[in-house]
């Protein structure tokens, strides 16, 4: 089948005091192979500072997954979500406040 790039959506939510949980969701992609990870200052975090969801079918013939991590409030600008799919890659910042970003990765 043809390649379908993911929609990437970064959200934030309050965690414990002084911390926030940032979640990066990728959806609507095909094939299922994808790299999704959080980076701090451009360096990927280790496996034990991130939580991954399974790559699951979304019912439309495409797939979805997510990765989350907990960070200190005020350091959001140091973190980005890195996505690689079918030879293309993109980085996605943490939104400020309670807003969220989502956009397609363009080939």
């Amino acid at each position: 089948g043809s390649t379908v790039p993911p929609m990437v959506n970064v959200t934030r939510s309050e965690a414990s005091e002084g911390n926030i949980t940032v979640t990066c969701r990728a959806s609507g992609f095909y094939p299922w192979n994808i790299t999704l990870s959080w980076r701090q200052d451009g360096v990927s975090l280790s496996h034990d500072t991130q939580q991954w969801g399974d790559v699951l079918p979304d019912g439309n013939g495409t797939y979805q997954t997510w990765v989350a991590t907990r960070i200190c409030q005020g350091e959001e600008q140091r973190f980005t979500c890195y996505m690689e799919h079918s030879g293309n890659h993109s980085t996605h910042p943490v939104p400020s406040g309670n807003s969220h970003h989502h956009h397609h990765h363009h080939h």
Partner: antibody
């Protein structure tokens, strides 16, 4: 002093089940990721499963997913590995290990003595 | 999955020699590489984490270097108690993967 003591291994027939336990002491158990790693008779090390500090997240190798379940009891400072539908290729020494936390990110800083699992008819 | 190619599979050296063991990752793992020592009949023990940081109590003759895909473990002034098998482990992402091991013997 960190101590990890595994138990529950033994000889089991193919298709059978076993439950491994790992009693932890010497550290705040609930604060750390915990792991099961096995060593095959050929001495290869294989990661089996991980459970996060808050019990929320579990991860499995493809070779055991759907057959093994990792769990923990933070009140009892104990890690478990429920193994079912066992196969001959699951024969190994099973080690419980502690995640390095913020001082040794991405590493397994302490290991138990291991418990042996043999799957044979 | 990230493959860890460890070499050599075995080596023989004289007491006092400096030896180097290499691990190559099939993709970028940044600094999330740890080294373990397993003496005959014993359990694996952490030597180095984060590619270059010495674990508590490990002698300073052990050192680690590298980032990205290439990593080395060096033992300077080889001692009798260093007879063991050494393994690398990538801690970048799941599934966690070990190198196949390097058995170190004394000539």
């Amino acid at each position: 002093e960190v101590q990890l003591v595994e138990s529950g291994g033994g000889l089991v027939k193919p298709g059978g089940s076993l439950k491994l336990s790992c009693a932890a002491s010497g550290f705040t158990f609930s604060d750390y990721y915990m792991y099961w790693v096995r060593q095959t008779p050929e001495k290869r090390l294989e990661w089996v499963a991980t459970i996060s500090d808050g019990i929320t997240y579990t991860y499995y190798s493809d070779s055991v997913r759907g057959r093994f379940t990792i769990s923990r009891d933070n009140a009892e400072n104990t890690l478990y590995l429920q193994m079912s539908s066992l196969k001959s290729e699951d024969t190994a020494m099973y080690y419980c290990s502690k995640g390095g936390g913020s001082t040794a990110r991405g590493a397994l800083d302490f290991w138990g003595q291991g418990t042996s699992v043999t799957v044979s008819s | 999955d990230i493959q860890m190619n460890q070499s050599p599979s075995s080596l023989s050296a004289s007491l006092g020699d400096t030896i180097t063991i290499t691990c190559h990752a099939s993709q970028n793992i940044h600094v999330w590489l740890s080294w373990y020592q397993q003496k005959p009949g014993n359990i694996p023990k952490l030597l180095i984490y984060g590619a270059s940081h010495l674990h508590t109590g490990v002698p300073s003759r052990f050192s680690g270097r590298g980032s990205g895909t290439g990593f080395t473990l060096t033992i300077s002034s080889l001692q009798p108690e260093d007879i063991a098998t050494y393994y690398c482990l990538q801690g970048q992402s799941y599934p966690l993967t070990f190198g196949s091991g390097t058995k170190v013997e004394i000539k």
